[in-house]
């Protein structure tokens, strides 16, 4: 499986909200020996690999943002902790998965990373990602709301596997 | 905050089994891997192999098939180590060490030391 | 497997001084490497983390570099507490394996 991320640079005002996306490609076992382990952090564009570094999201670690469940199922994170700081986590039966940011400030401006395992019986874990850059804006060059710009075809597919 | 605790010192005869205990707290216990880790005395760290709780998945090193059982209750946060037929190259310090997928052991036990001897 | 090679079994400095420790996978490995420290009567401690980044809390003195096949551990300034035997591990596929581990002494 890839994981996509169709948008690639989202730009957004100070105080507004937005979600950021990726998608789970390609074939995806629904066995009952699959376990999908999806998370979020903060990274940066490493010489050699983007998202090897992981940093929290507003000091909540990937392991405090992960969601774990089977196939295509759909899940949310542990609503207190991560609604506390403005964040939330979440998967349908898609293979879409997301994290909402709340409020957004300067601060928040960065690469963040998703990461999908999959987790099998007897076999090596299975590991990718996707990155995208968060500019939060202020002031009068500010956009009124969210302006997302598409990931290119090669980007978007941008697959890291162990 | 993230913690390890795992039961205390083993002696044991040749031919016995024992059965060592790693539990886990301040974390979703579930969600990440449990890897056990033998040190002989004097010697480096060898993987004896991983336990994922929330499914029961586990991958073990070929070193230590047969000798290793690994099994995890998620009703107490624990997982268990049981080595089988113990010879005296079992003797070692075992360890527990939480794994997150796809990334490292960030979180290690204390050490059980075993014992085996005559 | 992947064998993880430590070519020193000993490092001996004093206090103060840069040391490094290098480490060199039989494959390539990519980033996925981390190094550990094992101080005496003590659990190991991960401190570096695909191959470079520093784990929470671990002083800015310790550094790692490399990729691919060959990786390297610093100590920019050695300090008495930092006696220790420190141990790579990669963690590109399993079996996870470690090196013998390079047990650093200081004069």
């Known amino acids: 499986f890839k994981v996509a991320t169709p948008y690639s640079l989202y730009v957004c005002p100070e105080g507004q909200n937005v979600t950021l996306t990726c998608r789970l490609l390609g074939p995806v076992d629904k066995g009952h020996d699959v376990t999908f382990y999806k998370t979020w952090y903060r990274s940066s564009r490493g010489e050699v690999q983007t998202c090897s570094e992981r940093r929290p999201i507003r000091n909540l670690t990937f392991q405090d943002l992960h969601l774990h469940h089977g196939g295509h199922q759909a899940a949310n994170t542990s609503h207190d902790l991560a609604q506390r700081h403005g964040l939330e986590s979440a998967s349908d039966h898609h293979g879409n998965f997301s994290i909402t940011m709340r409020n957004l400030t300067l601060l928040d401006s960065g690469l963040y990373c998703c990461l999908v395992v999959e987790i099998r019986h007897h076999h090596s874990e299975h590991r990718v990602h996707g990155a995208m850059e968060l500019q939060v804006q202020t002031g009068k060059d500010a956009p009124s709301n969210c302006v997302v710009y598409p990931s290119s075809s090669q980007d978007s597919e941008n697959i890291t596997a162990a | 905050q993230v913690q390890l605790q795992q039961s205390g010192a083993e002696l044991m005869k040749p031919g016995a089994s024992v059965k060592i205990s790693c539990k886990a707290t301040g974390y979703t216990f579930s969600s990440s891997w449990v890897e056990w880790v033998r040190q002989r005395p004097g010697h480096g760290l060898e993987w004896i192999g991983e336990?994922?709780?929330?499914?029961?998945?586990?991958h073990y090193n070929e070193k230590f098939k047969g000798k290793a059982t690994f099994t995890a209750d998620t009703s107490s946060n624990t997982a268990y180590l049981q080595l089988s037929s113990l010879t005296s190259d079992d003797s070692a310090v075992y360890y527990c060490?939480?794994?997150?997928?796809?990334?490292?052991?960030?979180?290690w036990g204390a050490g059980t030391t075993v014992t085996v001897s005559s | 497997d992947i064998v993880m090679t430590q070519s020193h079994k000993f490092m001996s400095t004093s206090v103060g001084d840069r040391v490094s420790i290098t480490c060199k996978a039989s494959q390539d490995v990519s980033t996925d490497v981390a190094w550990y420290q094992q101080k005496p009567g003590q659990s190991p401690k991960l401190l570096i983390y695909s191959a470079s980044y520093r784990y929470t809390g671990v002083p800015d003195r310790f550094t790692g570099s490399g990729s691919g096949t060959d990786f390297t551990f610093t100590i920019s300034s050695v300090q008495a507490e930092d006696l220790a035997v420190y141990y790579c591990?990669?963690?590109?596929?399993?079996?996870?394996?470690f090196g013998g581990g390079t047990k650093l002494e200081i004069k």
């Open positions: 591990q990669q963690h590109y596929s399993t079996p996870w394996t």
């Open positions: 336990i994922f709780p929330g499914s029961g998945s586990t």
């Open positions: 060490a939480r794994r997150p997928p796809g990334w490292f052991f960030d979180v």
